[in-house]
């Protein structure tokens, strides 16, 4: 019993004056607490507690369940304890079969003994199975058996407390260990779609999937730059041990333009946090934006191919697309396809393939597209470059030589005189008159140019060359002169 110097408060004294007491089942337990400032007796075993305000604790017929720690406390808060074992051969263990352990921590199998004199107090696997090789434990007859550093692999381990009594092994009722996993990584979070585009009034619904080892992972939807609590619904599943999945679904039943923004799904556990975002854009109505992938003014050489290509954004999805030329709709030669196979794709491509274009096929080619909200169009002006063609070369009644040529771009006509019969003409002759004839005609056809020179300027036999040329090529026509005396004869035009 404790001894202290006079004047200082001292703990109560207990009779019998020993730390442990063994009584047989059915016998009397009589404990006396002596202290001038006695307050109470407290009894504890497992999670059970009982109190007694009388200084003598008497249990007339002891039962195994009376095994436990009896503590006497005085008014100074000082206490003294005695542990009583009630030996019952039919009930060697008191048990609370609740058995939970946190990974990497110790956990107590609560099977205190009613008889401290039995031997080989230990743990055994159920149905004769061995315990895991790395399982370490420390027995304590007054508390139970402490499993050290619980492993995840011990989850659902079935075991018994065991003692040897008179040479025989006696087992307690079975315990099943449930292991709470330690978080050793951040949660895994993913979102159903990275971006959403909606019209006003449509429903916005997005699901965040959170995966972790246990359900105690925390998760929430947040709106960036806002503290407003969002309404979310949960579904969750345990896919076997330590494989937990939660789906947190955020819904805005009728989205408005000012709901646009970035929404974050945030999850954390004791190891750390993770997040994923999705972007919502709400528009008051649908739209179509067209982007030409080549210049809308196109120059192409006669007989060559050209592809007219547009990209366009359409929301909602495009419903009708067409390419038109001269009020005529193309039924083939074009294709229209989404820019990506992504579910949230709003970008598309349309291509019109024009092959072996003729000079007569220049003009305006128009792409039209529509959805349920809007129509849009874009026009391409296609010019076909053609080598000049000499349409007429004549000597007029007034003695003028006239050359008419057509082509695109607009041909230039030059005149040359070749003395004798040479056809390599070098001396240039200035025209008297040059006119572009078809300025009132179709804007994309060939351009016709007329040029005239005065034949009276030529005094010798020879050849006059009319040469029409542009960026694409050149063409010539010739006039032959023959003089008899003072008279000009036989003006033979030829190309």
């Amino acid at each position: 019993q404790p001894s202290v110097s006079p004047g200082e408060p001292s703990p109560p004294s207990i009779h019998p004056g020993k730390s442990d007491l063994i009584v047989r089942v059915g016998d009397e337990i009589r404990l006396l607490c002596t202290d001038p400032g006695f307050v109470k007796w407290t009894f504890e075993i497992l999670d059970e507690t009982n109190e007694n305000k009388q200084n003598e604790w008497i249990t007339e017929k002891a039962e195994a369940t009376n095994t436990g720690k009896y503590t006497c406390t005085n008014k100074h808060g000082l206490s003294n304890s005695i542990y009583v074992f009630v030996r019952d051969p039919a009930k060697l263990f008191l048990v609370d079969r609740s058995l939970y352990g946190k990974e990497d921590n110790d956990t107590l199998v609560r099977c205190p003994l009613t008889d401290p004199e039995v031997t080989n107090y230990s743990l055994k696997g159920c149905q004769g199975k061995p315990l895991p090789k790395d399982l370490r434990f420390i027995p304590d007859p007054k508390a139970g058996i402490m499993i050290k550093s619980v492993k995840r692999a011990y989850h659902r381990l079935c075991l018994h407390c065991s003692v040897d009594q008179e040479g025989k092994s006696v087992l307690s009722e079975k315990f099943i260990l449930k292991v709470r996993p330690a978080f050793k990584a951040v949660p895994v979070v993913s979102v159903s779609k990275a971006s959403y585009l909606l019209r006003e009034g449509e429903e916005f619904t997005v699901t965040c999937t959170i995966k972790d080892v246990s359900s105690s992972v925390y998760s929430t939807w947040k709106r960036e730059n806002s503290q407003t609590k969002l309404q979310e619904k949960y579904n969750s599943w345990h896919h076997g041990d330590f494989n937990y999945e939660r789906q947190a679904t955020l819904t805005i039943s009728s989205a408005r333009v000012n709901d646009s923004g970035v929404f974050m799904c945030y999850a954390n556990n004791t190891f750390g946090s993770a997040n994923v975002t999705t972007t919502l854009e709400v528009v008051d109505k649908g739209f179509i934006n067209i982007f030409p992938m080549i210049n809308t003014t196109v120059f192409v050489n006669d007989g060559e191919n050209v592809d007219l290509i547009v990209e366009y954004e359409a929301f909602p999805k495009p419903e009708h697309q067409q390419w038109i030329y001269m009020n005529r709709t193309f039924t083939d030669k074009w294709e229209d396809y989404p820019k990506s196979e992504n579910e949230s794709n709003i970008r598309y491509v349309s291509e019109l393939h024009l092959t072996r274009l003729k000079g007569t096929e220049g003009g305006t080619y128009t792409f039209l597209v529509s959805n349920s909200d809007v129509n849009a169009a874009i026009a391409f002006n296609v010019y076909v470059n053609t080598k000049p063609e000499i349409l007429t070369y004549d000597r007029l009644v007034n003695g003028m030589l006239q050359c008419v040529a057509a082509g695109f771009p607009e041909p230039t006509i030059d005149w040359y005189f070749c003395p004798g019969t040479e056809q390599r003409c070098s001396a240039s002759v200035l025209p008297v008159d040059v006119q572009t004839l078809n300025s009132s005609g179709p804007p994309f056809g060939k351009l016709v140019v007329q040029s005239s020179i005065d034949s009276s300027a030529f005094k010798h036999n020879g050849t006059v060359e009319c040469k029409a040329y542009n960026d694409v090529g050149k063409t010539s026509a010739y006039f032959n002169f023959a003089f008899k005396g003072n008279n000009k004869e036989q003006i033979h035009p030829h190309t």
Epitope: D47, E48, D96, R97, S98, L99, K178, R180, S215
Partner: nanobody, 123 residues
């Protein structure tokens, strides 16, 4: 075969009371601390209350403290939950279960759990 059979659920107005019972068969409940847990529509399991093997120690979730009382009668192998001052947010299926994790977490299993009884709090 172990069975835990809950009863006593039903429709009650806010502010009203109910007493849930859980009768065990094929199992001696005195060998277990016992718990009540609940699951509200669309939510996960939530631990409500627990009681030690002999009944002298009781534990409650903050959301029910002062309104719910857990008790047991080991001689009848029965667990009880007295629910007073009920609120709409108490609407759930209530389950009795063997075991209690003294760290206050429910994390993936009881040795045994009943089929549940539905409590609906609505005006």
């Amino acid at each position: 075969e172990v069975q835990l059979l809950e009863s006593g659920g039903g429709l009650v107005q806010p502010g009203g009371s109910l007493r849930l019972s859980c009768a065990a068969s094929g199992l001696t409940i005195s060998t277990y601390a016992m718990s009540w847990v609940r699951q509200a529509p669309g939510k996960g399991l939530e631990w409500v209350s627990a009681i030690s093997t002999g009944g002298s120690s009781t534990y409650y979730a903050d959301s029910v403290k002062g309104r719910f009382t857990i008790s047991r009668d080991n001689s009848k192998n029965t667990l009880y939950l007295q629910m007073n001052s009920l609120r709409a947010e108490d609407t759930a299926v209530y389950y009795c279960a063997t075991g209690y994790d003294s760290s206050g977490h429910y994390y993936g299993g009881f040795d045994y759990r009943g089929q549940g009884t539905l409590v609906t709090v609505s005006s």
